[in-house]
Amino acid sequence: ELCDDDPPEIPHATFKAMAYKEGTMLNCECKRGFRRIKSGSLYMLCTGNSSHSSWDNQCQCTSSATRNTTKQVTPQPEEQKERKTTEMQSPMQPVDQASLPGHCREPPPWENEATERIYHFVVGQMVYYQCVQGYRALHRGPAESVCKMTHGKTRWTQPQLICTGEMETSQFPGEEKPQASPEGRPESETSCLVTTTDFQIQTEMAATMETSIFTTEYQ
């Protein structure tokens, strides 16, 4: 079952799927001046069995001016540095990321791919959030969103992440210091100086899953 909407947006944060559930579709989009080859797929589809999942179909782009099929070559670094997962810019996954049963990894780039990747997620998909560069988490509750089916409709859970500019926060003189954290997440001595990497403390994430570096998105 496809999710009706995109995952929720959080101010000054980006989201990333660490793996894609079977049934996920990725549109075959080409950058300006290029189009899908005539017999080319409209989308890639994450399919599989109990032991292995992979992307069916290959996206191929050709110059709008010619009718040639394209060579499958690795794009230049500047071409692959900004890829979007629906509304989010995201880099490729590290190739050594542990596989999750029933999930596909980030598909490799294709030549002349559009800079924005448009995914169609399915129920059960989870995406993870972190603050963009220059912002930090004022509060980090569960920083993920899951597409769930309730009463016959799909909805994404709301991530409890609040991102703020580095120097915006304050702890007033005489305010109690935060107590020691039972969850073992690092805390700041003074709120203005917190610079911990957001995903360093993503304890909810499966231990087997490596986090990827997020690229920034400013709104």
Partner: antibody, heavy 115, light 107 residues
């Protein structure tokens, strides 16, 4: 079920300070930040600030800096709003509200500042 | 600060009617906007978050739309329990600000 419990009313003299409590129950308290909102006849709803129930880190509306101080006590799942040097202008209803989208609100504490 | 301007300030309608309340932000708020309903003597209740997502338990006759600076809340087939005051609020950048409210009264 999720509940945010606040005292119903407080009557205080001008010049004193007051600490209003907001006790969360029915959920994991530290998962959700806590906001404080003031409602007065003159100004409708005004956001005072937000505090991380996890770290104690707080973000204030500039308008309330020096007037309001937010704290949390994780052991009792309670957020506090302390209001200093109270005047009749501070008479209002003070609400706590949970999470990014203010999905649950306390019933409000009606503060009356009067001599 | 972002100024949220709600219109109309008050509105009279009958049960079964459809009404629309609008909210204009003085700056781009993207889709970071909530709608709340408040009844006399009660605390506000979340109706819609992120401009268009219905909060859990909210009837489907309510719907939110818009992005950027223009937002609206539509109530189809008004029910007796829908009368009260409605507020919009943005959460893009601080301070978060609320609209002045729209009082929906029974005609």
């Amino acid at each position: 079920q999720v509940q945010l419990q606040q005292p119903g009313a407080e009557l205080v003299r001008p010049g004193v300070s007051l600490k209003i409590s907001c006790k969360g129950s029915g959920y994991t308290f530290t998962d959700y930040a806590m906001h404080w909102v003031r409602q007065s006849h003159a100004k409708s709803l005004e956001w005072i600030g937000v505090i991380s129930t996890y770290s104690g880190d707080a973000l204030y509306n500039q308008k309330f800096k020096g007037k309001a101080t937010m704290t949390v006590d994780k052991s009792s799942s309670t957020a506090y709003l302390e209001l200093a040097r109270l005047t009749s202008e501070d008479s209002a209803i003070y609400y706590c509200a949970r999470g990014v989208t203010f999905d649950y609100w306390g019933q409000g504490t009606t503060l009356t500042v009067s001599s | 600060d972002v100024v949220m301007t709600q219109s109309p300030a008050s509105l009279s309608a009958s049960v079964g009617e459809t009404v629309t309340i609008t909210c204009r932000a003085s700056e781009n708020s993207y889709s970071y906007l909530e709608w709340y309903q408040q009844k006399q003597g009660k605390s506000p209740q979340l109706l819609v978050y992120n401009a268009k997502t219905l909060a859990e338990g909210v009837p489907s006759r309510f719907s939110g739309s818009g992005s950027g600076t223009q937002f609206s809340l539509k109530i189809n087939s008004l029910q007796p329990e829908d009368f009260g005051t409605y507020y919009c609020q943005h959460h893009y950048g601080t301070p978060y600000t609320f609209g002045g409210g729209t009082k929906l009264e029974m005609k």
